[in-house]
């Protein structure tokens, strides 16, 4: 009897639309009113423990009181009806939770897919959040038959996989219903033949076979998915070299119908390629399969496509009638070697005389030659054959080189050291660029590269360091031998000097002093020394700064005060900043030489 509530609130389980209004009514039971000696005037409404002011209540009759809420902005509100009993004690009568949310929106973008070997799955856009439990049901039918409803699971409310097997070549109608406590809506209906929604399994067993006859082709074979018996397939075939990250694609028109092999052409010899393939219905209606597993193959070797860069150096200390010549060449990059390099063949022909042949595995050959003119040729060999020959004329000992390049310049750009020149009027076969780091501590170890005779601007292809002085030499090579070399110094990137100059006095007079210093060693310059600044001062005086041209190694300070201690230091500047040298002190004499007090 005591557990029986004193009254009730109507409605008991309200679900209302967000931002709508809501009225609740509390009705007291007669027995309760008699027991507590109360009526509707004694009702107190509370929400979330806050008491609503009495002016907002409407007394309907002696047993009922109502309260109205405008613009419910919360998803749930606890509402209780209470009565004031003896001694103003509050007794709870009943409580409800006002749940609020939104009605479902019409589902949009309904689409279906038939993954090969699986049942049809449809998905849709369910619209805005309703804040309420909203059920989505996928409905489907043939013209003559209704299929079982597909109820979306709570954790995946915007997709559903049907329970029946797919039948191709019969149109099906599909739509979605969304329903919650505030309403029910239906999507637009879509009508289609499931054959146009197929996503095939990817082709499998992809394999790659090379050809001994043609080094530019690879043949692909694969097994098609079973769906090929239902639909005609088309393919995307993509390939890339093993180290590349971007894929190239075979023109789609070449793979527009069902097949199980394809020959890829125009590939580079002796190169590993990775392939992948996918397929779909040939008319483009449906979905592409996932990509197959990748498969790789290596094209067959071809003879080297280019002769190596070829140059020579003559040992300056030659014995009577002979000279030591070192022939040097560069390894071909893989895209020109076209296979595994086996060896190099060098021939040396003395002018109008006999031929000497050498087979070499290294990239240099040292020979003793007479002072005559020689013709050297170099070929590189792999399993398939030989490259064209690189030809080099080694002129006679008394040869006078002429026709250098003109206007030689070197400059850094985009983290590379560029070299440019004006081409001589004579026909140049090729250019040889040599460079080395100038250092007081180590000899200049030369690196080199060859450029075509048409080139007049290039960058040094080596591992260059910043703050190092590079001596760059450009030699044009003509049919009868090398032209005169031209050289220039350059930096990849300058920095301030590591040390400043050490200044000293050469001669000190009563009113002047001749200062001198040594040029900074190249290892500490870190750039081109553009100018010096001499700073000098007395203990009590202001500092004076004098700029001096970088070609000077001495400077005279004049208008000095006699019998005075001077402090002097010197800074050297590159394009990137300066560095001070150590401070040096000297004292001017009281009297000039021969002068008496």
């Amino acid at each position: 009897e005591l557990l029986d509530p004193c009254g009730y609130i109507s409605p008991e389980s309200p679900v209302v639309q967000l931002h709508s209004n809501f009225t609740a009514v509390c009705v007291l039971k007669e027995k309760c009113m008699d027991y507590f000696h109360v009526n509707a005037n004694y009702i107190v409404w509370k929400t979330n423990h806050f008491t609503i002011p009495k002016e907002q209540y409407t007394i309907i009759n002696r047993t009922a009181s109502s309260v109205t809420f405008t613009d419910i902005a919360s998803l749930n509100i606890q509402l209780t009806c209470n009565i004031l009993t003896f001694g103003q004690l509050e007794q709870n009568v009943y409580g409800i939770t006002i749940i609020s949310g939104l009605p479902p929106e019409k589902p949009k973008n309904l689409s279906c897919i038939v993954n090969e070997g699986k049942k049809m799955r449809c998905e849709w856009d369910g619209g805005r959040e309703t804040h309420l439990e909203t059920n989505f049901t996928l409905k489907s039918e043939w013209a003559t038959h209704k299929f079982a409803d597909c109820k979306a699971k709570r954790d995946t409310p915007t997709s559903c996989t049907v329970d029946y097997s797919t039948v191709y070549f019969v149109n099906i109608e599909v739509w979605v219903e969304a329903e919650n406590a505030l309403g029910k809506v239906t999507s637009d209906h879509i009508n289609f033949d499931p054959v146009y929604k197929v996503k095939p399994n990817p082709p499998h067993n992809l394999s790659v076979i090379n050809s001994e006859e043609l080094s530019s082709i690879l043949k692909l074979t694969w097994t098609n998915p079973s769906i090929k018996s239902v639909i005609i397939l088309k393919y995307n075939i993509q390939y890339r070299t093993k180290d590349a990250s971007t894929w190239s694609q075979i023109p789609p028109e070449d793979t527009a119908s069902t097949r199980s092999s394809f020959t890829v052409q125009d590939l580079k010899p002796f190169t590993e390629y990775v392939f992948r393939i996918r397929c779909m219905k040939e008319d483009g209606k449906g979905y592409w399969s996932d990509w197959s597993e990748e498969a790789s193959g290596i094209t067959y070797e071809d003879r080297p496509s280019k002769a190596p860069s070829f140059w020579y150096k003559i040992d300056p200390s030659h014995t009577q009638g002979y000279r030591t010549v070192q022939l040097v060449w560069k390894t071909l990059p893989p895209f020109e070697a076209n296979g595994k390099i086996l060896d190099y063949e060098v021939t040396l022909t003395r002018w109008k005389s006999h031929l000497q042949n050498y087979t070499v595995n290294a990239t240099k050959l040292t020979v003793n030659l007479t002072n005559d003119r020689y013709l050297a040729t170099l070929t590189v060999r792999n399993l398939v054959g030989k490259s064209d020959a690189a030809v080099l004329t080694i002129p006679a000992c008394d040869f006078q080189a002429t026709h250098p390049v003109m206007d030689l310049k070197a400059f850094p750009k985009d983290n590379m050291l560029w070299v440019e020149w004006t081409t001589p009027r004579e026909s140049v076969k090729k250019y040889i660029l040599e460079w080395c780091v100038l250092s007081d501590k180590a000899p200049c170890i030369t690196d080199w590269q060859q450029e075509d005779g048409t080139v007049h601007r290039t960058y040094l292809r080596g591992n260059l360091a910043e703050s190092k002085c590079y001596l760059i030499t450009v030699t044009p090579v003509y049919a009868d031998g090398p032209g005169s070399p031209e050289s220039i110094k350059a930096y990849l990137k300058q920095a301030p000097p590591s040390k400043g100059p050490t200044v000293r006095t050469k001669k000190v007079g009563k009113n002047e002093a001749v200062l001198e210093w040594d040029q900074l060693p190249v290892d500490v310059q870190n750039g081109f020394i553009r100018n010096y600044t001499i700073f000098y001062r007395t203990i009590i005086g202001n500092e004076t700064a004098v700029n001096v041209d970088s070609s000077h190694t001495e400077y005279t300070l004049s208008s000095l005060t006699s019998d005075t201690l001077y402090m002097v230091r010197m800074a050297a500047y590159t394009d990137e900043g300066g560095k001070d040298g150590p401070e040096f002190t000297f004292t001017t004499p009281k009297f000039a030489q021969g002068e008496i007090e």
Epitope: H19, T47, N48, P53, V67, T70, D71, I72, A73
Partner: nanobody, 124 residues
């Protein structure tokens, strides 16, 4: 977290006007019911006015009806209370509050946290 900052209070003579502002952050302002409460020295806190989220509906306690106007600018996340014909009994600290809903002029408070408020003193 939700922050409500009241401003615009001050000392004003009887019959004068003030405009209180409340700047909100950390909430979806244009989805929130808002209102004003006040607390006079030595008295309990009482509701003054409530306004719907769109600003279309506004409600007032009888004691301020015809003198006070509640409004909001959803673009600026700001609530206002225009107070005209002020009386000495309007002297109080005024608080702005987010509400679950309007029960007439009473904005059902979202929580038990009350900010600094802004002091209004009506005196000659």
């Amino acid at each position: 977290q939700v922050q409500l900052q009241e401003s615009g209070g001050g000392l004003v003579q009887p019959g004068g006007s003030l405009r209180l502002s409340c700047t909100a952050s950390g909430l979806t302002f244009d989805d929130s019911v808002m209102g004003w409460f006040r607390q006079a020295p030595g008295k309990g806190r009482e509701a003054v006015s409530c306004i719907s989220s769109s600003g279309a509906n506004a409600f007032y306690a009888d004691s301020v009806k015809g003198r006070f106007t509640i409004s909001r600018d959803n673009a600026k996340n700001t609530l206002y209370l225009q107070m005209n014909s002020l009386k000495p009994e309007d002297t109080a600290t005024y608080y702005c509050k987010r509400g679950h809903a309007c029960a007439g002029y009473y904005p059902i408070p979202y929580d038990d946290y009350w900010g600094q408020g802004t002091q209004v003193t009506v005196s000659s």
